[in-house]
Interface confidence: low
Amino acid sequence: KSSNEATNITPKHNMKAFLDELKAENIKKFLYNFTQIPHLAGTEQNFQLAKQIQSQWKEFGLDSVELAHYDVLLSYPNKTHPNYISIINEDGNEIFNTSLFEPPPPGYENVSDIVPPFSAFSPQGMPEGDLVYVNYARTEDFFKLERDMKINCSGKIVIARYGKVFRGNKVKNAQLAGAKGVILYSDPADYFAPGVKSYPDGWNLPGGGVQRGNILNLNGAGDPLTPGYPANEYAYRRGIAEAVGLPSIPVHPIGYYDAQKLLEKMGGSAPPDSSWRGSLKVPYNVGPGFTGNFSTQKVKMHIHSTNEVTRIYNVIGTLRGAVEPDRYVILGGHRDSWVFGGIDPQSGAAVVHEIVRSFGTLKKEGWRPRRTILFASWDAEEFGLLGSTEWAEENSRLLQERGVAYINADSSIEGNYTLRVDCTPLMYSLVHNLTKELKSPDEGFEGKSLYESWTKKSPSPEFSGMPRISKLGSGNDFEVFFQRLGIASGRARYTKNWETNKFSGYPLYHSVYETYELVEKFYDPMFKYHLTVAQVRGGMVFELANSIVLPFDCRDYAVVLRKYADKIYSISMKHPQEMKTYSVSFDSLFSAVKNFTEIASKFSERLQDFDKSNPIVLRMMNDQLMFLERAFIDPLGLPDRPFYRHVIYAPSSHNKYAGESFPGIYDALFDIESKVDPSKAWGEVKRQIYVAAFTVQAAAETLSEVA
């Protein structure tokens, strides 16, 4: 029997029943419950929360809820030897030391086990030397320093402001530039919005607030000691020297009060332009070293953190499908936090909890989804997406054969302005259709759809009358599902107005001040934005699990493939002479995209017309849709990044958070004019065009009539 026959409820009614069951008040209650103490990965507190969630998901009505544990490499500060940075004079005396902890927020003064700010996986070390200010430590910032300003970072300690790109990329860039240490700091230009007070009186970062975070360059590997395989009881572990992605130089984060003390003494070169100046009352001189009277003073880092193999726990809940139990729709978000996790991750975990409760309520009334829904509470996301990656490595054979879709559920909010969605093009129409059915929570849009407010506030930069939907990058738990396994993925959250708020992320990100009160007082007092995000995430899961024909539109992939081909071609065309010299042609790629477009169009026509009452044909058509994302996977992976296997999308090599299209070609073309061997470099461009063209053509053929 189909799930609808079993309950005699129409699909539309089911969706409405599911959405109506979601309550803002419950999300608020769950958020409060999840944020009263820290839940750092690998700690007893986070294990206890895993068991609590397991118990509650069972009560909510899931068929089964299991803990899946792994022993992975984590990183912690040394409790007896705190990390700090000092300014030392010529005698080696410490004349200034940075703070050892953040001043606790009101009401949390007596909470124990607040981990002090640190850069996870920093090696130990006590380097000392002159300081060089490197702006955001992006690739282009080091180009500016080394190529234009002729400043050598070799043997220097660099200080970089947080923002714009993933912190791990900053550290990698500093290492490549020869630096011997990295200081990361939050500049008010990026983490203090004008006209807003600092916490606890507003949502801005106080001077003593510091952003924690890992500084790995894992490129999708998961546990650094067991790349490609689960960190289970019989795992073979690499030695620390062979571990994947660990930084080789000490790194430490500080707040802007401490940064002021380091930056105010800077001498050497003036900043190259205004884009290198933040908002502190300092000259933003690049260095190297301190100015005039202070030129004999140096900076010294004292880093004593340790890397330890530690047990982590995922919670995996199952709601078995009535018709296609061997097809999995996954909703997953992490549970571990740096401290209280008021936004990251618990604003997401609370939403997942309410979605599980709503699905459970329907199940108790006799309903089942058509396909199986898996719910996941991931551990150790903050340490490199470890929980989700290890679970996916352990279950990769099942997932690649049965995985329909993965919906991510980290922070539900990073602002309260409008919706933000990143997803596979296969989900564009699903997201558009769903948001047209949901009410906007925004002021001034009463009675209007979410689609309307979203489109108005965040228009597509390319297409009129459409909202912006971004490419998936990384930095969150969808990575292994999308970039490695090729499972259609998406994420949604409420975000800020990027036009008026130029700061990076939200100001209190990964600080001790990310509390329940931050959300309840300043971001979403009525929890209406949380509810909307629950409706979007939950609605997507519902449709993916319950629609008879999978709600994927392959024609949208055709459109973006053409756009991405145009884009990469225009990048290449900045080198017309070399393209001529080395006979570089994009004809094969454009031809493949054209074929894909035609085949996708014909497939969509067949999808309208086929006999949906024939279960074999229905399954066949759905399998073609499910496996389309899989068809973009290259088993050999991208050059030097074997776990990034998607040929159309990968995290940018310069910023893990950002998605890049045709990444193989893009990376081959990047800075190609500086390559020593142009013939070899352009040969690699040609090879990458070949790989991309083949992959697009092969993917197109999966949509052809099967016989």
Epitope: F463, S464, G465, E499, A558, V559, R562, T597
Partner: antibody, heavy 116, light 107 residues
Framework: EVKLEESGGGLVQPGGSMKLSCVAS????????MNWVRQSPEKGLEWVAE??????????HYAESVKGRVIISRDDSKSSVYLQMNNLRAEDTGIYYC???????WGQGTTLTVSS | NIVMTQFPKSMSISVGERVTLTCKAS??????VSWYQQKPEQSPKMLIY???NRFTGVPDRFTGSGSATDFILTISSVQTEDLVDYYC?????????FGGGTKLEMK
């Protein structure tokens, strides 16, 4: 109310130059990409050029038929967009409209005639 | 360049009639098609964007549909003021291109 007002059209000889202007009001001009579109009985509606906003580095795009002869520019402080046309040809004759991003709002047009 | 072909070039119709205008793209443009109405001595006005979304202030007798290469503008019950020129245009890729237009005339 969104308003776009073009000016600067007129009669010009082949090989001559002309600068068209468009003043915008009723919206935050600096946030929007702007286009010039022309219309003639022979060619119908024809997109000419686009200039993007500061956040897009004022990127410009041109139709092949005008590339190298036309420059689109903008002055956000004056809420104005311009079309400098050089080496004019008879086929450039038509009504020139200034349009807001996606051609969702159009001005009333200014007529350019290229004839000896 | 993507060619947008409109047909018929002109149509004679009576007030109250339902009318369907067609626009065909030479290659897939997704749903990035707009429809414009142009009255004599006036500039074009947007009617439909994103193939099927009615622009602000446009009467609901105007409906757009289609995707990929085939697009339709339907006027459910033609009024006298609707007997003017209609153009489709694509904003999927450069250069942006327009159809040659369809002229609605009184029967």
């Amino acid at each position: 109310e969104v308003k776009l007002e073009e000016s600067g059209g007129g009669l010009v000889q082949p090989g001559g130059s002309m600068k068209l202007s468009c003043v915008a009001s009723g919206f935050t001009f600096s946030n929007y990409w702007m286009n010039w579109v022309r219309q003639s009985p022979e060619k119908g509606l024809e997109w000419v050029a686009e200039i993007r906003s500061q956040s897009n580095n004022f990127a410009t795009h041109y139709a092949e038929s005008v590339k190298g002869r036309v420059i689109i520019s903008r002055d956000d402080s004056k809420s104005s967009v311009y079309l400098q046309m050089n080496n004019l040809r008879a086929e450039d004759t038509g009504i020139y409209y200034c349009t807001r991003r996606w051609n969702n709002f159009w001005g009333q047009g200014t007529t350019l005639t290229v004839s000896s | 360049n993507i060619v947008m072909t409109q047909f018929p070039k002109s149509m004679s119709i009576s007030v109250g009639e339902r009318v369907t205008l067609t626009c065909k793209a030479s290659e897939n443009v997704g749903t990035y098609v707009s429809w414009y109405q142009q009255k004599p001595e006036q500039s074009p006005k947007m009617l439909i964007y994103g193939a099927s979304n009615r622009f602000t202030g446009v009467p609901d007798r105007f409906t757009g549909s289609g995707s990929a290469t085939d697009f339709i503008l339907t006027i459910s019950s033609v009024q006298t003021e609707d007997l003017v020129d209609y153009y489709c245009g694509q904003s999927y890729t450069f250069p942006y291109t327009f159809g040659g237009g369809t002229k609605l005339e009184m029967k």
